[in-house]
Interface confidence: medium
């Protein structure tokens, strides 16, 4: 899984799956996550605190999959069959960035370097697992 800043080695083997507790990330199509996440947060509380900064953007509705995309990084899907957190695929990130970055720029916030789409898998395959956009956001 080649995702640079998103360190796939974090959480390898040791950490078990845990229920998603972050309010923004409930009801998005999966309910188990694993910490540390892909951004290095060691607890859901820590992840939720940073994720809260995106709440206005999610509420604005610049992209229907923004919430799912953010949650895939801050509270990535966990399954006992795979030892690493599973992020979103790159196209979902690129579409969210394309539509949401202009709104962020209006308020003098650039798209965060930590959400660099280029480091996400291009598509889901056995060697680089990632989540495609859900059919119903």
């Amino acid at each position: 899984l080649e995702i640079g800043r998103f360190d796939p080695e974090r959480g390898r083997g040791a950490a078990p799956c845990q229920a998603v507790e972050i309010p923004m990330c409930r009801g998005i199509g999966y309910n188990l996550t694993r910490m540390p996440n892909l951004l290095g947060h060691t607890s859901q509380g820590e992840a939720a605190a940073e994720l809260a900064e995106f709440a206005p953007l999610v509420q604005y509705g610049c992209h229907s999959h923004l919430r799912f995309f953010l949650c895939s990084l801050y509270a990535p899907m966990c399954t006992d069959q795979v030892s690493t957190p599973i992020p979103a695929c790159r196209p979902m990130c690129e579409q969210a960035r394309l539509r949401c970055a202009p709104i962020m720029e209006q308020f003098n916030f650039g798209w965060p370097d930590s959400l660099d789409c280029a480091r996400l898998p291009t598509r889901n395959d056995p060697h680089a697992l990632c989540m495609e956009a859900p059919e119903n956001a």
Epitope: C62, H63, S64, Q95, L98, P102, E105, G110
Partner: antibody, heavy 124, light 113 residues
Framework: QLQLQESGSGLVKPSQTLSLTCAVS??????????WSWIRQPPGKGLEWIGS???????YYNPSLKSRLTISVDTSKNQFSLKLSSVTAADTAVYYC????????????????WGQGTLVTVSS | DIVMTHTPLSLSVTPGEPASISCRSS????????????LDWYLQKPGQSPQLLIH???HRASGVPDRFSGSGSGTDFTLKISRVEAEDVGVYYC?????????FGQGTKVEIK
């Protein structure tokens, strides 16, 4: 009335770096709702989007050029710049700078202002 | 990348007559989030920079005469000029901005008979 003016070397040797600057007048490059773009047009051919930058420094590059491309912005000088390394004859083109407008309420987006273009020839 | 294809590539029109240019995209340009179709038309007059004619499928840019209109849906788009005038000569380009990299069609050259 917003104006964009490209400047830079008109002749670049193969393998060297092409450098262009776009000076923006009649408006602030730091205004929200816009990104600032480079587009090129090889002689007698169509248009190709190169990349864009916001005043914050966030960039969007065409993947076909990304490995050789750097776009930067200098808000204090109200200008943005293009650097394209390791050029070949295929990079010979008229290079345009343009403003890409984005309306956050409607989602409408388009290139609304263009520079007059500058011809860059890659030749030894 | 999304491929944009023009037909015809050149067009010779009598002044006062209508003209129609088609553009096809390799995937849908409709954004289901906001309902917008991200297809624009630009005109490049001889020796000039491109200028916006139509944005977001059918919205005329400021100062563009109402003889220009844009229509279409999904992957098939049309630019119509109800009555061609001498000043309409040049190359017309469609462009998509639904997905990076933004891409242009190869252009349709319009000349006056």
């Amino acid at each position: 009335q917003l104006q964009l003016q490209e400047s830079g070397s008109g002749l670049v040797k193969p393998s060297q770096t092409l450098s262009l600057t776009c000076a923006v007048s009649g408006g602030s490059i730091s205004s929200g709702g816009y990104s600032w773009s480079w587009i090129r047009q090889p002689p007698g051919k169509g248009l190709e989007w190169i990349g864009s930058i916001y005043h914050s420094g966030s960039t969007y590059y065409n993947p076909s050029l990304k490995s050789r491309l750097t776009i930067s912005v200098d808000t204090s000088k109200n200008q943005f710049s293009l650097k394209l390394s390791s050029v070949t004859a295929a990079d010979t083109a008229v290079y345009y700078c343009a403003r890409f407008y984005y309306d956050i309420l409607t989602g409408y987006s388009y290139f609304d202002y263009w520079g007059q273009g500058t011809l860059v020839t890659v030749s030894s | 990348d999304i491929v944009m294809t023009h037909t015809p590539l050149s067009l010779s029109v009598t002044p006062g007559e209508p003209a129609s240019i088609s553009c096809r995209s390799s995937r849908s340009l409709l954004d289901t989030d906001d309902g917008n179709t991200y297809l624009d038309w630009y005109l490049q007059k001889p020796g000039q920079s491109p200028q916006l004619l139509i944005h977001t499928l059918s919205h005329r840019a400021s100062g563009v005469p109402d003889r220009f209109s844009g229509s279409g849906s999904g992957t098939d788009f049309t630019l119509k000029i109800s009555r061609v005038e001498a000043e309409d000569v040049g190359v017309y380009y469609c462009m998509q901005s639904i997905q990076l990299p933004w891409t242009f069609g190869q252009g349709t050259k319009v000349e006056i008979k």
